[in-house]
């Protein structure tokens, strides 16, 4: 198990390893310090859900797990294997919302999450463009992107659309779990550093009386729980049966599973590459496996922006400027 890999370095030394003791004692503080520094990294989750009422439309939901306020959200989609993409919607908390076909309704759900309903009929079918990306900007901290993939499947599948409730529970569990582990880790780190400062070089002790061994084992489950709790995940139930999709990959079974670490989802790969990706110990991931019966046409051309601006419930109506390069 992963957590056990760290434990041996914290166990008492064997005879003749006196010089290494100081180094070994410092392993845990460094690991905890790294945990304290990295656990605050913002992340993005993505959920794609087929609408039960209309098989040809579905909803994309994206959320930001971070402390900063959102300055802009961009939702885009594109074809598989690195094909070019297009912007579906841009949501600005003050200037409003812009969206482009086949996006039907983009809106803020909370201050840190958005939803986008897509129309999927004919050439505009979502199946024709298999990857969705959400990018959250938090000025001046930075921006983060996560992508969810809609792989073509040989069988539509029978799975039901997921409910958003588990995602919210997972978010809460992630926040509470990491906070707890962080608090414990940082306090413990301070305790260790203080002890290290006020103690002479440690002497060799037999394994039964060593204070380090129990401490290492007590910490290992904490690391495991941190890894387990910090997984705000989203289920994407999707399998498309594209009519004309050049890069369709044949799949042997009714369902296609992949795990996608959203904090590292920079450039989408093909389904085959994702299938072997291990579930990350830390970070959001998107598991894919859905029943979507929409017929996919060709990838639509990049349509121009709609002339109507959709007001943001949290800000004034957007200004309508000159059209850009869409």
């Amino acid at each position: 198990m992963r957590t056990e890999a760290q434990v041996p370095a914290l166990q008492p030394p064997e005879p003749g390893l006196e010089g290494a003791m100081g180094h070994r004692t410092l392993v845990l503080p460094w690991v905890l310090l790294t945990l304290c520094v990295t656990a605050g990294t913002p992340e993005v989750w993505v959920q794609v859900r087929m609408e039960a009422t209309e098989l040809s439309s579905f909803t994309i939901r994206c959320g930001f797990l971070g402390s900063g306020s959102i300055s802009l959200v961009t939702v885009s989609w594109g074809g598989p294997n690195g094909a070019g993409g297009t912007t579906l919607a841009v949501l600005h908390p003050e200037r409003g919302i812009r969206q482009w076909a086949p996006a039907r309704q983009a809106r803020w759900e909370t201050q840190s999450s958005i939803s986008l309903i897509l129309e999927g009929s004919g050439a505009s079918s979502p199946c024709a463009n298999t990857t969705f990306c959400c990018k959250f900007a938090s000025f001046p901290e930075g921006s983060w992107e996560a992508c969810g993939s809609l792989p073509p499947s040989s069988d539509p599948g029978l799975s039901a659309p997921p409910t958003p409730a588990p995602i919210l529970r997972a978010d809460l569990a992630g926040i509470l779990g990491v906070s707890g582990v962080l608090l414990f880790g940082c306090v413990y780190l301070l305790h260790l550093l203080r002890r290290h400062k006020h103690r002479p070089a440690p002497r060799l002790q037999p394994s039964r009386t060593s204070p380090q061994a129990p401490r290492a084992r007590a910490w290992a489950p904490s690391q495991a729980s941190q890894a387990a709790l910090h997984v705000p995940y989203a289920t994407i139930n999707t399998s498309c049966r594209p009519a004309t999709l050049d890069t369709a990959h044949p799949h042997g079974g009714p369902s296609w599973w992949a795990s996608l670490p959203t904090h590292a989802a920079h450039r989408p790969q093909g389904p085959a590459a994702w299938a072997s990706t291990p579930i990350p110990a830390r970070g959001s991931f998107v598991s894919v496996e859905n029943g979507l019966y929409a017929q996919a046409g060709e990838r639509p051309p990049h349509t121009g922006p709609g002339l109507t601006l959709f007001p943001d419930p949290r800000g004034p109506r957007a200004m309508e400027g000159p059209l850009g390069v869409r």
Partner: nanobody, 127 residues
């Protein structure tokens, strides 16, 4: 985390040329429109040029048309701005940003109106 890193700025004489580059990482570069904006000393942010996701469409502010050329290489995740016939009024910090400022209008532009932004590169045109 998304990163945009500009390079290629410097001191150049009027009439000279510079090529700015912007290396992108941490996001699906080929899915997004990209722009260059600039901020002259003591002035507000000004839009310079935008290119769409596949490089097929470009647009420029009137003052740089015919002199500046925006381009991108999606295979290298890089955005470029070729600046020719430079003038003193082109002196500014040039920022590489993700997004098209036309979405919400060009008035009172701020870096917070974009999906991603770089740290900027200084271009000084002086004899």
């Amino acid at each position: 985390e998304v990163q945009l890193v500009e390079s290629g700025g410097g001191l150049v004489q009027p009439g000279g040329s510079l090529r700015l580059s912007c290396a992108a990482s941490g996001f699906t570069f080929s899915y997004y429109d990209m722009s260059w904006v600039r901020q002259a000393p003591g002035k507000g942010l000004e839009w310079v040029s935008t290119i769409n996701s596949n490089g097929g469409r470009t647009s420029y502010v009137d003052s740089v048309k015919g002199r500046f050329t925006i381009s991108r290489d999606n295979s290298k995740n890089t955005l470029y701005l070729q600046m020719n016939s430079l003038r003193a009024e082109d002196t500014a910090v040039y920022y590489c940003v993700e997004g098209d400022p036309h979405n919400f209008g060009l008035e009172n532009l701020s870096l917070r109106d974009f999906g991603s932004w770089g740290q900027g590169t200084m271009v000084t045109v002086s004899s």
